[in-house]
C-alpha cells in the first residue's frame, strides 16, 4: 500500500522542513517562518507551538521539529509534552482548588507535587513505628519483637514513593 | 515566478560530447528534483534523466551509461552531460522542475523554453 500511494502522490518526496505547495504546482516548499513539517510528503506545514505566561522555552521550533516547553520556577509539567503547567506546593502540602493546604495528620507529601499520601502502616507487618511521621516524610517501621533476637537488627526503609499525582491503592 | 533557463546546445558529429546546463530561479532549489527531458522532430516529448534533492538520479534506459545529470544547489543549476552522441539524441532539450521531489514517474511542474541539440556527420 505505501509503495502504491508513493507512485500515486506526486508529494510524498517532498523533504521534512518542507511542505508540497499546491499553489505552485505541487513543488516542494519550505515551511514558513514559525512553521515546521517533521515528516516527508506533507501537503501543509503545522505551526510552531509558542511557549508563552507560565511556560517558557525548553527547545526553539525548527523547520523540521516543534518548539519543546517547560514550565516557569515555582511550576511543573502536566500531561504529554508538558500540555499545562500546575503550581508548586512546599513539602507537605499538596494542590486543591483553593490552592497549597497542609498534609491533613496521617498524609504526607515528600515531593512539590502530587497529593498527600497515607503513612506506612507498621501494624500490617506485625512492625512497631520507630520514627514517627510528619507532614513531610512517611513513618520509619521498627522490627518488630519477634526480629529482636540477639544479633539481629533491623529498620524497614519507608515504601518508595509512588508516582506523583497517583492516589494510593 | 518559477524561471528556467536552458543553455548548452549546438550542433555536433556522433560520438561527439555536450554539456546542457539549467539555470533555475523563484523557487527552492535546492529541495525540488529537476529533469531533463527531449522532443524530436515529429516525436512525442520523453524522459531522459532527473535527479532528487538527495541527489538520486534516475534515466531513461536509452541514454543510460552516456549522459550524466547532476546539479549545483550552490548556483541552481542542474547539468546534463551527453557523451557518445548519436544521430537519434538530436532534439529540442527541455529541463523540467518535478512535482513532489520525485524522480519515479515523474511528473513535471514547470518547463524550460528548450535548447535544440542536432547530432550530424
Known amino acids: 500500500f505505501e509503495r502504491t500511494r508513493s507512485l500515486q502522490d506526486p508529494c510524498s518526496n517532498c523533504p521534512a522542513g518542507t511542505f508540497c505547495d499546491n499553489n505552485r504546482n505541487q513543488i516542494c516548499s519550505p515551511c514558513p517562518p514559525n512553521s515546521f513539517s517533521s515528516a516527508g510528503g506533507q501537503r501543509t506545514c503545522d505551526i510552531c507551538r509558542q511557549c508563552k505566561g507560565v511556560f517558557r522555552t525548553r527547545k526553539e521550533c525548527s523547520s523540521t521539529s516543534n518548539a519543546e516547553c517547560d514550565c516557569t520556577p515555582g511550576f511543573h509539567c502536566l500531561g504529554a509534552g508538558c500540555s499545562m503547567c500546575e503550581q508548586d506546593c512546599k513539602q507537605g502540602q499538596e494542590l486543591t482548588k483553593k490552592g497549597c493546604k497542609d498534609c491533613c495528620f496521617g498524609t504526607f507529601n515528600d515531593q512539590k507535587r502530587g497529593i498527600c499520601r497515607p503513612w506506612t502502616n507498621c501494624s500490617l507487618d506485625g512492625k512497631s513505628v520507630l520514627v514517627n511521621g510528619t507532614k513531610e516524610r512517611d513513618v520509619v517501621c521498627g522490627p518488630s519483637p519477634a526480629d529482636l533476637s540477639p544479633g539481629a537488627s533491623s529498620v524497614t526503609p519507608p515504601a518508595p514513593a509512588r508516582e506523583p499525582g497517583h492516589s494510593p491503592q | 515566478e518559477v524561471q528556467l533557463l536552458e543553455s548548452g546546445g549546438g550542433e555536433v558529429q556522433p560520438g561527439g560530447s555536450l554539456r546542457l546546463s539549467c539555470a533555475a530561479s523563484?523557487?527552492?532549489?535546492?529541495?525540488?528534483?529537476m529533469g531533463w527531458y527531449r522532443q524530436a522532430p515529429g516525436k512525442r516529448r520523453e524522459f531522459v534523466a532527473a535527479?532528487?534533492?538527495?541527489?538520486?538520479?534516475v534515466y531513461a534506459e536509452s541514454v543510460k551509461g552516456r549522459f550524466t545529470i547532476s546539479r549545483d544547489n550552490a548556483k541552481n543549476t542542474v547539468y546534463l552531460q551527453m557523451s557518445s552522441l548519436r544521430a537519434e539524441d538530436t532534439a529540442v532539450y527541455y529541463c523540467?522542475?518535478?512535482?513532489?521531489?520525485?524522480?519515479?514517474?515523474?511528473?513535471?511542474?514547470?518547463w524550460g523554453q528548450g535548447t535544440l541539440v542536432t547530432v550530424k556527420p
Open positions: 535527479i532528487e534533492s538527495s541527489r538520486n538520479t
Open positions: 523563484g523557487f527552492s532549489f535546492s529541495i525540488n528534483a
Open positions: 523540467g522542475l518535478l512535482k513532489g521531489n520525485r524522480v519515479v514517474s515523474p511528473s513535471v511542474a514547470y
